[in-house]
């Protein structure tokens, strides 16, 4: 008695697919595979397959059913923080070769990484013209201010809305200031946040307000405090710089905008007698913390002149280092003061028409605005590698 195995039904390729190998008939243990055209993928229902092979069984049936070759669907594109996405090919079209365009919210954000145009590729991922599968980035535009002209505020004037949108009020023990970098970092002075370095959550960070005591402000909380490793508390103010990482990104608007970091060419806008602007809620001439955000325009002072001013007692020799810059009037009267610490001394980059942080309010004479003495600021340009490393690492 002999029997021959029944041949299996001839495999009909699914639409947009083909069978291989093609045979006249398929008998016991013969197999075939299905390959889909570019832009189509093997699916068993909703489940994707990289490959498909069926084997002919002795009862003349295939051991598995035919899959489908379905057009690749990249799915709805991810939302872009501070941006939006537009369907170019057609409303809601997300299949192979469909095109979408990401864009950032105008005025306050600019697109980084690529041009925002993405295509649904055969691998099922939205892909930029540069081949990137990750989202573009909407980075806050820095250095925008309502002012068009170019810590410690003494002899200053009241700021108006949008003048210093990077200004941050730091409460937590004492009143201090800082400047917003990007949308989740604050640049400040090390001495202003030294006590909170191990208790970042104790810092109450406020922005988007002019009035120090106003209930209307944007609240931010600190995730971590990074103090420059070269800073020694109670032993001078060298390396008086710190970064605060916020636990959430803040929404950028005309009242909350980051300050720019100085470009390599920034020194050309920070020469002796160039005007910088310091802002804060520190002590005024009346001896009280300012209720309203104040600012003062002050010239950069020759470094040797400043060093000499702080060589005589009660200041120890070498108080002014190469990591500092000084600003103020020889005649006095205009200065930053206690409570302004950590705030930014900003300059207008006339090439980019953006404001950048040149200094951080650090220290000065006991009597603010004293003739022959100057406000001393951390020289930010010396710390760009340190700032960039911290921000990229964390």
């Amino acid at each position: 008695y002999t029997s021959t195995a029944q041949p299996c039904p001839y495999p009909m390729a699914p639409p947009n697919g083909h069978v291989s190998p093609v045979q006249a008939k398929y008998i016991l243990k013969d197999s075939f595979s299905i390959f889909c055209e570019t832009g189509y993928e093997l699916l068993q229902g909703h489940l994707p397959l990289k490959s498909f092979t069926a084997v002919c069984q002795k009862d003349g049936s295939w051991d598995r059913p035919m899959p489908a070759c379905s057009i690749v669907d990249c799915g709805p594109p991810d939302d872009l923080p501070s941006g939006r996405v537009e369907y170019i090919t057609g409303p809601g079209v997300t299949t192979y070769k469909a095109v979408i365009q990401y864009s950032c919210e105008e005025t306050f954000y600019t697109m980084k990484v690529n041009d925002g145009k993405y295509v649904c590729e055969a691998d099922g991922f939205w892909t930029s013209s540069k081949g990137e599968k990750s989202l573009p980035v909407c980075e806050p535009v820095c250095g925008l201010s309502a002012r068009t002209t170019g810590g410690r505020i003494y002899g200053g004037q009241k700021a108006k809305p949008g003048d210093f949108p990077w200004q941050v009020l730091i409460l937590g023990g004492t009143t201090a200031a800082g400047a917003l970098l990007y949308d989740n970092w604050v640049l400040t002075a090390a001495h202003a946040v030294y006590e909170q370095k191990h208790d970042a959550s104790a810092l109450d960070i406020r922005m988007g307000t002019l009035k120090r005591l106003s209930p209307h402000y944007t609240q931010a909380w600190s995730e971590a405090v990074f103090i420059h490793e070269g800073y020694t508390h109670d032993a001078g103010f060298d390396n008086d710089i710190a970064l605060i990482k916020l636990n959430n990104k803040v929404v950028i608007n005309s009242n909350i905008t980051p300050i720019c970091l100085p470009r390599k060419e920034a020194e050309s806008f920070m020469r002796t007698d160039d005007i910088g602007t310091a802002s804060g809620w520190g002590l005024t001439q009346r001896g009280f913390l300012a209720r309203n955000l104040m600012y003062v325009d002050i010239p950069i002072v020759d470094h040797q002149k400043c060093t000499a001013a702080y060589e005589k007692p009660p200041y120890p020799r070498g108080s002014v280092t190469a990591n500092m810059l000084c600003a103020g009037l020889e005649s006095g009267g205009k200065d930053s003061c206690r409570g302004d610490s950590g705030g930014a001394l900003v300059f207008l980059d006339s090439e980019t028409e953006r404001w950048f942080v040149g200094g951080i309010v650090s220290w000065g004479s006991m009597n603010c605005g004293e003739a022959g003495q100057y406000g001393v600021y951390t020289k930010v340009i010396n710390y760009i590698p340190w700032i960039e490393n911290i921000i990229s690492d964390f």
């Epitope: 229902g45 909703h46 489940l47 994707p48 059913p65």
Partner: antibody, heavy 116, light 107 residues
Framework: DVQLQESGPGLVKPSQSLSLTCTVT?????????WSWIRQFLRNKLEWMGY???????SYNPSLKSRISITRDTSKNQFFLQLNSVTTEDTATYFC?????????WGQGTSVTVSS | DIVMTQSQKFMSTSVGDRVSVTCKAS??????VVWYQQKPGQSPKALIY???YRFSGVPDRFTGSGSGTDFTLTISNVQSEDLAEYLC?????????FGAGTKLELK
């Protein structure tokens, strides 16, 4: 033989994130198929949560889309579930699985309680 | 979402009987249905996929049939180890959805 094993904390506080790991042995998660997360509530109701495919593409249950993320570490042959803003309703036994295609394999499940 | 309805929560049977468990999809799912067996404290075990294809190692007393919206799992010669919960799953479209289950118990 293909084996899957779930791991992660058994207790999560409301509003926090639930994070689970599925370690796969006996088959590379990049070779083929879709690798799913499924959960079973106390009354035995099963819910498919989503998958990550061999290519790294994901598909999520729309009811969870705003809270769920499935990722993988191909070097460790692991895939992960993160479910944000959990409530007591997320208390369940969580399974990782390779469903249907090329054989059907499930982990033994890990019980997660959401409670303060 | 596609609703998979298993109208009978419980079914009583005896060893040696033939029993049919049914599952109805709220819309056409082709043949993209799996049948699972689950015992207390265990993960589900797949029996049938693509409506009628038996997974390897599954006894041939288990058979599946149906397409479109109506599906049946038949156990032709019930054994004591078959007393468990039986669930259907559609994997045709996102989201994959399970039936509520039918518990097979002794008369």
């Amino acid at each position: 033989d293909v084996q899957l094993q779930e791991s992660g904390p058994g207790l999560v506080k409301p509003s926090q994130s639930l994070s689970l790991t599925c370690t796969v042995t006996g088959y590379s998660i990049t070779s083929d198929y879709a690798w799913s997360w499924i959960r079973q509530f106390l009354r035995n109701k099963l819910e498919w949560m989503g998958y990550i495919s061999y290519s790294g593409r994901t598909s999520y249950n729309p009811s969870l889309k705003s809270r769920i993320s499935i990722t993988r570490d191909t070097s460790k042959n692991q895939f992960f579930l993160q479910l944000n803003s959990v409530t007591t309703e997320d208390t369940a036994t969580y399974f990782c699985a390779r469903l249907i295609t090329g054989g059907d394999y499930w982990g033994q499940g890990t019980s997660v309680t959401v409670s303060s | 979402d596609i609703v998979m309805t298993q109208s009978q929560k419980f079914m009583s049977t005896s060893v040696g009987d033939r029993v049919s468990v049914t599952c109805k999809a709220s819309q056409n799912v082709g043949i993209n249905v799996v049948w699972y067996q689950q015992k207390p404290g265990q993960s589900p075990k797949a029996l049938i996929y693509s409506a009628s294809y038996r997974f390897s190692g599954v006894p041939d007393r288990f058979t599946g049939s149906g397409s479109g919206t109506d599906f049946t799992l038949t156990i032709s010669n019930v054994q004591s180890e078959d007393l468990a919960e039986y669930l259907c799953l559609q994997y045709d479209i996102n989201p994959l959805t399970f039936g509520a289950g039918t518990k097979l118990e002794l008369k």
